[in-house]
């Protein structure tokens, strides 16, 4: 699997969209996990609602939120108030019993806000305007890169 690289600004929100074949993954919950090293396991951060019909409802764990549009085949993960410690390799997964199929690998990079080093005055951005979504938002960078990380669950 290729790895998608997403960049977000510290303190802001980063939105990740993982697409999948909705018919192939019918009835399956989705999860967002963090890869612990190149060979390590993927540690579950958050998963969608236990009832598949309610997967569209947002589920939160700390500053991470997940919701699944099961008909469109898009699971959306939002990392709120991005911190330097959030940088790393993640996976979108489709769950079936103990089996976890990797839908997408995502490398999250956190950029320091340049305004942190100077007087920002009264400049501020409402939270609604400060979310990043893949390559669809002007301030976010998305690129694919080949990685040798094995798909782990």
């Amino acid at each position: 699997l290729n790895t998608t690289v997403l960049q977000g600004m510290a303190g802001q929100s980063l939105r990740v969209s993982c697409t999948y074949d909705a018919l192939k993954h019918w009835g399956r919950r989705k999860a967002w996990c963090r890869q612990l090293g190149e060979e390590g396991p993927c540690q579950r951060v958050v998963s969608t609602h236990g009832v598949w019909l309610l997967a569209f409802l947002k589920k939160r764990n700390g500053s991470t939120v997940i919701a699944d549009d099961t008909l469109a085949g898009t699971v959306t993960i939002t990392l709120k108030n991005l911190q330097a410690g959030d940088a790393g390799l993640y996976q979108c997964q489709s769950l079936r019993g103990r089996e976890a199929e990797v839908l997408q690998k995502v490398l999250v990079e956190v950029l320091e806000d340049p305004l942190d080093d100077q007087d920002a005055g009264d400049l501020w951005v409402p939270e609604e305007s400060s979310s990043f979504e893949g390559a669809q938002v002007e301030h976010s960078t998305s690129r694919n890169q080949e990685t040798s990380f094995p798909p782990t669950s």
């Epitope: 018919l23 192939k24 019918w26 598949w52 019909l53 019993g97 103990r98």
Partner: antibody, heavy 122, light 106 residues
Framework: EVQLVQSGAEVKKPGESLKISCKGS????????IGWVRQMPGKGLEWMGI????????RYSPSFQGQVTISADKSISTAYLQWSSLKASDTAMYYC???????????????WGQGTMVTVSS | EIVMTQSPATLSVSPGERATLSCRAS??????LAWYQQKPGQAPRLLIY???TRATGIPARFSGSGSGTEFTLTISSLQSEDFAVYYC????????FGGGTKVEIK
């Protein structure tokens, strides 16, 4: 009419290879998983494996992993079950079945082929 | 691998009586359970999916219940065409079947 039609009965010798087929019609073949189920004479049903013809993603039961190969040709809406070296213990009826789905998120094998009887004897 | 255990192996019932078949999973399968009917020389037929929903065309005398590890298929009033072998199957993790229950005429 939605249906799965399987290839005819086979009589083989131990050590021979075999590939049986299951052709789907009346629905979008690439959008449903197809499973294979074994039923030995006088015995119950055993799930062997399953394939998604859309991308040929395949899963096997631990009991059958490495014993058989499941494949599909979406251009002719056909799934296959094959053996490289048959054994007498492979004598059984083999069914293919479509994994149906419902709006609740439930899935189950809703459409079944008529079965292919495989007899392995020297 | 999840193991499905059905009981009894054989159930002798008179026509018109109620039949209760049990299925137990070795670990929770939520409501991801189906029931099938198989008559001699025929392919299995789906009766119940999602533990309790009747498949298209299945008579109301068939009902399913349970969740987690314990499931039941009930045939409220057995008809002559209901004497067959019944299998439960989980599709929560793999697609394993139970060993079957043969419902025979008493």
């Amino acid at each position: 009419e939605v249906q799965l039609v399987q290839s005819g009965a086979e009589v083989k010798k131990p050590g021979e290879s075999l590939k049986i087929s299951c052709k789907g019609s009346g629905y979008s073949f690439t959008s449903y998983w197809i499973g294979w189920v074994r039923q030995m004479p006088g015995k119950g049903l055993e799930w062997m494996g399953i394939i998604y013809p859309g991308d040929s993603d395949t899963r096997y039961s631990p009991s059958f992993q490495g014993q058989v190969t499941i494949s599909a040709d979406k251009s002719i809406s056909t799934a296959y079950l094959q053996w490289s070296s048959l054994k007498a213990s492979d004598t059984a009826m083999y069914y293919c079945a479509r994994l149906g789905r419902w709006s609740s998120g439930s899935t189950a094998f809703d459409i079944w082929g008529q079965g292919t009887m495989v007899t392995v004897s020297s | 691998e999840i193991v499905m255990t059905q009981s009894p192996a054989t159930l002798s019932v008179s026509p018109g009586e109620r039949a209760t078949l049990s299925c137990r999973a070795s670990q929770s399968v939520s409501s991801n359970l189906a029931w099938y009917q198989q008559k001699p020389g025929q392919a299995p037929r789906l009766l119940i999916y999602g533990a309790s929903t009747r498949a298209t065309g299945i008579p109301a005398r068939f009902s399913g219940s349970g969740s987690g590890t314990e499931f039941t298929l009930t045939i409220s009033s057995l008809q002559s065409e209901d004497f067959a072998v019944y299998y439960c199957q989980q599709d929560d993790d793999g697609y394993t079947f139970g060993g079957g229950t043969k419902v025979e005429i008493k």
